[in-house]
Interface confidence: low
């Protein structure tokens, strides 16, 4: 059966031969070439068969011709457009790295029928025009010689001669567009205008000050220097900047305590309340402090428990009436005190110091009784006349047949004197055994005490 149509053609193919007939008999072959930029493995052939054109090898087709790698350029990169493989129709567009620029205007290569068009683009370093030093200044930190061009990234720094300061930027660098990053600075004479002092007024009367000249000022009532009362003219202006701020107090540091309210700044007149903890107490009466022009009054402090007015038994503080209003007092305070007649301090003196410690007053018993040992009739008198201090106990030895009352053998110096009173009393006894001597008193079955010849009998059964 004939084919009544021309052989079909893809847009990548070119039909070879002459095809001017209206019909084509069965078996007619149409042979195709690939268009420029395309290729196939062997010819593409269609055959007329049973009235229609069929491909002899359906898998065979014209595909884009590959070009290979377009080539890298130093100091630059390329990107592909129109595709993502190196084949016909794709374009490699080159861009230079920062600080480099294309030599020439063509920045691409195209994969064409005969391979890549154009040469590989070249990237050269960006250059900036030479720069000169400003008047009354010089260029530093440049490796370049004068009047030479600078490459991208290179920097020049300017310094001004003494008495001059830079107006503008002290450094500029060669940018990636071939221009300097900043305007060249000027060197201008250093001077400062008389400054306005907010909440203060000048003492110095000049209008313009030269470098290192000093400006003095004072602050209005209720204000204080932010830093100090004068400023120096420097190339960066007044240092420190003259300024007066409302008198204020720093946030108080209260070890072992907290305060409220918390403020960034405490102005004169502001009041805080503070609490102490962990066994600590406000060091002064009350627990408030006020910010004044001289700081916190009273100073907020937490101390260990203060000492109340000391109650000195058998003694007292010197200048008692003068001191009493100042109590309670803090740990560490001490006062001189005296002891009454018949009493002395633990150091053996009639006066000493009493100290406020974290455990209270020290010494705890400031005045101790002095006891002088009396003459013992019917006793041994090795201690006669000797002084003993409150709390001291001593042995008493009576002559045979005598003893302390109630068979005691020691006397103790107490707050009110000796206890019991040292005296040797006649003892009569009947023995349970045949022994004799002072020790037998304590073994006796029955003891009779003769006190001043009276008839009172105390029977002690052991």
């Amino acid at each position: 059966e004939d084919c009544n149509e021309l052989p079909p053609r893809r847009n990548t193919e070119i039909l070879t031969g002459s095809w001017s007939d209206q019909t084509y008999p069965e078996g007619t072959q149409a042979i195709y070439k690939c268009r420029p930029g395309y290729r196939s493995l062997g010819n593409v052939i269609m055959v007329c068969r049973k009235g229609e054109w069929v491909a002899l090898n359906p898998l065979r087709k014209c595909q884009k011709r590959p070009c290979g790698h377009p080539g890298d350029t130093p100091f630059g990169t390329f990107t592909l457009t129109g595709g993502n493989v190196f084949e016909y129709g794709v374009k490699a567009v080159y861009t230079c790295n920062e600080g480099y620029q294309l030599l020439g205007e063509i920045n691409y290569r195209e994969c064409d029928t005969d391979g890549w068009t154009n040469d590989i683009p070249i990237c050269e370093v960006v250059k900036c025009l030479p720069v000169t030093a400003p008047e009354n200044g010089k260029i530093v930190s440049s490796a370049m010689e004068p009047d030479r061009e600078y490459h991208f990234g290179q920097a020049v720094r300017f310094v001004c001669n003494s008495g001059y300061k830079i107006e503008g930027d002290e450094e500029m660098h060669c940018s990636d567009d071939g221009f300097w990053s900043k305007e060249k600075p000027k060197c201008v004479e250093i001077s400062c205008k008389s400054p306005d002092v907010i909440n203060g007024s000048p003492i110095s009367q000049k209008i313009i000050y030269k470098e290192n000249e000093r400006f003095q000022y004072k602050c209005n009532m209720g204000y204080e220097y932010s830093e100090r009362g004068d400023a120096v003219c420097t190339e960066s202006g007044w240092r420190p900047l003259p300024s007066c701020e409302e008198k204020s107090c720093d946030n108080p540091y209260i070890p072992n305590g907290d305060y409220s309210p918390l403020r960034i700044k405490h102005r004169t007149g502001d009041e805080i309340t503070y609490q102490c903890r962990n066994g600590f107490y406000p060091a002064t009466r009350g627990n408030t402090a006020k910010c004044t022009s001289t700081g916190w009054i009273p100073a907020p402090r937490c101390t260990l428990k203060p000492c109340d007015y000391p109650d000195i038994k058998h003694g007292g503080l010197y200048h008692e009436n003068m001191r009493r209003p100042y109590f309670p007092v803090a740990v560490g305070k001490y006062y001189s005190y005296y002891c009454d007649e018949h009493f002395e301090t633990p150091s053996g003196s009639y006066w000493d110091h009493i100290h406020c410690t974290q455990d209270g007053w020290s010494p705890a018993v400031p005045c101790l009784r002095k006891c002088y040992f009396p003459y013992l009739e019917n006793g041994y008198n090795q201690n006669h006349g000797r002084k003993f201090v409150q709390g001291k106990s001593i042995d008493v030895a009576c002559h045979p047949g005598y003893a302390l009352p109630k068979a005691q053998t020691t006397v103790t110096c107490m707050e009110n004197g000796w206890s019991p009173t040292p005296r040797c009393i006649r003892v009569s006894f009947t023995l349970g055994g045949g022994g004799s001597g002072l020790n037998d008193i304590f073994e006796a079955q029955k003891i009779e005490w003769h006190e001043g010849g009276g008839g009172s009998h105390h029977h002690h059964h052991h």
Epitope: D258, N278, D308
Partner: antibody
């Protein structure tokens, strides 16, 4: 056993003074290891601490800022009790009022003992 | 003032299950000098005053069952009841006693599911 016994009126007229007393048994108001507090509770404000008094060589008082201008807490050592006086009351002061102890020498500490509470209504 | 915020406002838990209540303070209640958190937990049942359960954030008050425990430090704290009992139905409050005015959370109502 330590107990706190509250007393005082349950109804106070606006602008008058609210006065409550808390009697302490088993402890001392001038104890060196406790502080004595007043706290109130209402649906609108929840639990609200009002202030406290305690003795450490002398008497200390702390009040909440919200009531500072109107409140006084007084210890009474002779009766071993402490009292709350809140003047210029408004219906906003309607609440259950509690006295409470924080019972630790190392102030501050939590409230370990509470009174039974007194419902106070401010109304004319 | 230090603001105490509890979550959730109410909680329903089955008997024997774990209940967890959170409390957040607007600033730290940890005192560095003694490394203690000044935070307490209370339980309040209807018609009764609050009862102290936990102090120093994690120390159980004497007589409080060991199913109650507290944890956390600085600004974030938790009260845990490990196995809920019927008698634990109450409102629970956290409270800071770090600085005056002492402040309480708004409370968490605990119910049985």
């Amino acid at each position: 056993q330590v107990q706190l016994q509250q007393s005082g009126p349950g109804l106070v007229k606006p602008s008058q003074t609210l006065s409550l007393t808390c009697a302490i048994s088993g402890d001392s108001v001038s104890s060196n290891s406790a502080a004595w507090n007043w706290i109130r509770q209402s649906p609108s404000r929840g639990l609200e601490w009002l202030g406290k008094t305690y003795y450490r060589s002398k008497w200390y008082n702390y009040y909440a800022l919200s009531v500072k201008s109107r409140i006084t807490i007084n210890p009474d050592t002779s009766k071993n009790q402490f009292s709350l006086h809140l003047n210029s009351v408004t219906p906003e002061d309607t609440a259950v009022y509690y006295c409470a102890r924080d019972g630790d020498y190392y102030l501050p500490s939590p409230f370990d003992l509470w009174g039974h509470g007194t419902m106070v209504t401010v109304s004319s | 003032d230090i603001v105490m915020t509890q979550s959730p406002d109410s909680l329903a838990v089955s008997l024997g299950e774990r209940a967890t209540i959170n409390c957040k303070s607007s600033q730290s209640v940890l005192y560095s000098s003694n490394n203690k958190n000044y935070l307490a937990w209370y339980q309040q049942k209807p018609g009764q005053p609050p009862k102290l359960l936990i102090y120093w954030a994690s120390t159980r008050e004497s007589g409080v069952p060991d199913r109650f425990s507290g944890s956390g430090s600085g600004t974030d704290f938790t009260l845990t009841i490990s196995s809920l009992q019927a008698e634990d139905v109450a409102v629970y409050y956290c409270q800071q006693y770090y600085s005056t005015p002492y402040t309480f959370g708004q409370g968490t109502k605990l119910e049985i599911k």
